[in-house]
Amino acid sequence: LPLPSGGDEDDLSEEDLQFAERYLRSYYHPTNLAGILKENAASSMTERLREMQSFFGLEVTGKLDDNTLDVMKKPRCGVPDVGEYNVFPRTLKWSKMNLTYRIVNYTPDMTHSEVEKAFKKAFKVWSDVTPLNFTRLHDGIADIMISFGIKEHGDFYPFDGPSGLLAHAFPPGPNYGGDAHFDDDETWTSSSKGYNLFLVAAHEFGHSLGLDHSKDPGALMFPIYTYTGKSHFMLPDDDVQGIQSLYGPGDEDPNPKHPKTPDKCDPSLSLDAITSLRGETMIFKDRFFWRLHPQQVDAELFLTKSFWPELPNRIDAAYEHPSHDLIFIFRGRKFWALNGYDILEGYPKKISELGLPKEVKKISAAVHFEDTGKTLLFSGNQVWRYDDTNHIMDKDYPRLIEEDFPGIGDKVDAVYEKNGYIYFFNGPIQFEYSIWSNRIVRVMPANSILWC
């Protein structure tokens, strides 16, 4: 096989190599049915692999390593990331603003009304930010024909059974153009179980309208599926920019707040929480976290929900208790204990169970000291010290942050400890504070933790 693997030859099975080759042929410069697109340097397997690694923000090695294979094995949309379906003619966008859709058949996993509601809501995502209108037809030919099918279902792009490829849609154009197909070997739901039909449909309809995949992990048009929570869906800014570049803005956007993916080198970047996790550093911002390995400069960006689906989208504070292999995550008046990917039974708990007074609405930052077994909890302009060993709040607390750590300001957004120094984050600034000399030794931009 023409795919070089990283490291030892016995790293990857023959099955993995064949899977990776199929993946790259499907999603990176797929050849057309007649095989007219001959393999050339640009579409060789190594080149495709490099493109795929670049697309997902992985280290571009041109070698198949476990990080790359992990990404390949995640559930995703069947539309190519680079290159396009070559069987059917396409246009850049629809030349009209009034489009029709028809639900040709239904999945047995949901009621008809649930399916109809999911599709209606998915179209509304796009009509809310553009002049587009969508009308449902009950028979005949619509611009966007929606159907559920399994394996080979009539378009030469077969589905693959449970998980893997979830759905695909064709770009604007005649015949198959605009049509959206959903793999009925998946379990479709209107919740976080199985695959959420609304979320997948909203993504696929983006393709039906002419959008390609986005490299932004926070975008709806990112190719990999992540359930983003029960609360009101807000179309990310990246998708709004994309669709409005094709169709322009609508008259009135009912949800004018469109979440942006944080830029790690933005000089005004402030952070929500920082914790170590089994030797790595997790840096939380909005719905995301950066995962920084000690030997790497490039941090990987993830949606928090892709790691921990049961957690809220945004968190306030976090700390690790390494000897127990646990991390604690705070949001509002609740906190969670996590072992790796798993939430411990009995959580979330109320922060008042730690001995905090009822008027404390949230913890803004937290840091644990393994040598003493103590954890500092920051809220507003105050700090508490919790004894993790005896599960009791220390006497003489709370104290004023300004008194215990003079010079760092009267609030803490995020904090972590390393080699006898505490790093306090306050807005776009971080303070390196020496535990031994009890003073600030350096002031740096917050994003220097991300090698900016």
């Epitope: 990080n67 995640k74 790691f307 411990l344």
Partner: nanobody
């Protein structure tokens, strides 16, 4: 509740490779994260590698780049491919599904000699 059985342990020279398997029976394996822990003589049990239901992997810093965790949900099996083994990797390796409060296997011994 998932029942787990590890296999694939044994003795190997430093620099060699082993592939551990973890066969799951009982309830649906795909619903649980899958982790490997290890315990060396007179030491605390430590996390080695984990893979979530969404196939996101996580490694202890000491094994990253040498060990690869994977899972086959259809077969109900988890794997740990261990390359470039070192004497300090000697330990009993335990398979886990669902985290500390989840299910554990009985372990398989890995001995790496110099």
């Amino acid at each position: 509740e998932v029942q787990l059985v590890e296999s694939g342990g044994g003795s190997v020279q430093a620099g060699g490779s082993l592939r551990l398997s973890c066969a799951a029976s009982g309830s649906t394996f795909s619903r649980y994260s899958m982790n490997w822990y290890r315990q060396a003589p007179r030491k605390q049990r430590e996390f080695v590698a984990g893979i979530s239901t969404a196939r996101i992997t996580h490694y202890a810093v000491s094994v990253k780049g040498r060990f690869t965790i994977s899972r086959d949900n259809a077969e109900g099996t988890g794997y740990l491919q261990m390359n470039s083994l070192k004497p300090e990797d000697t330990a009993v390796y335990y398979c886990n599904a669902g985290g500390l409060q989840g299910s554990w296997g009985l372990g398989t011994l890995v001995t790496v000699s110099s």
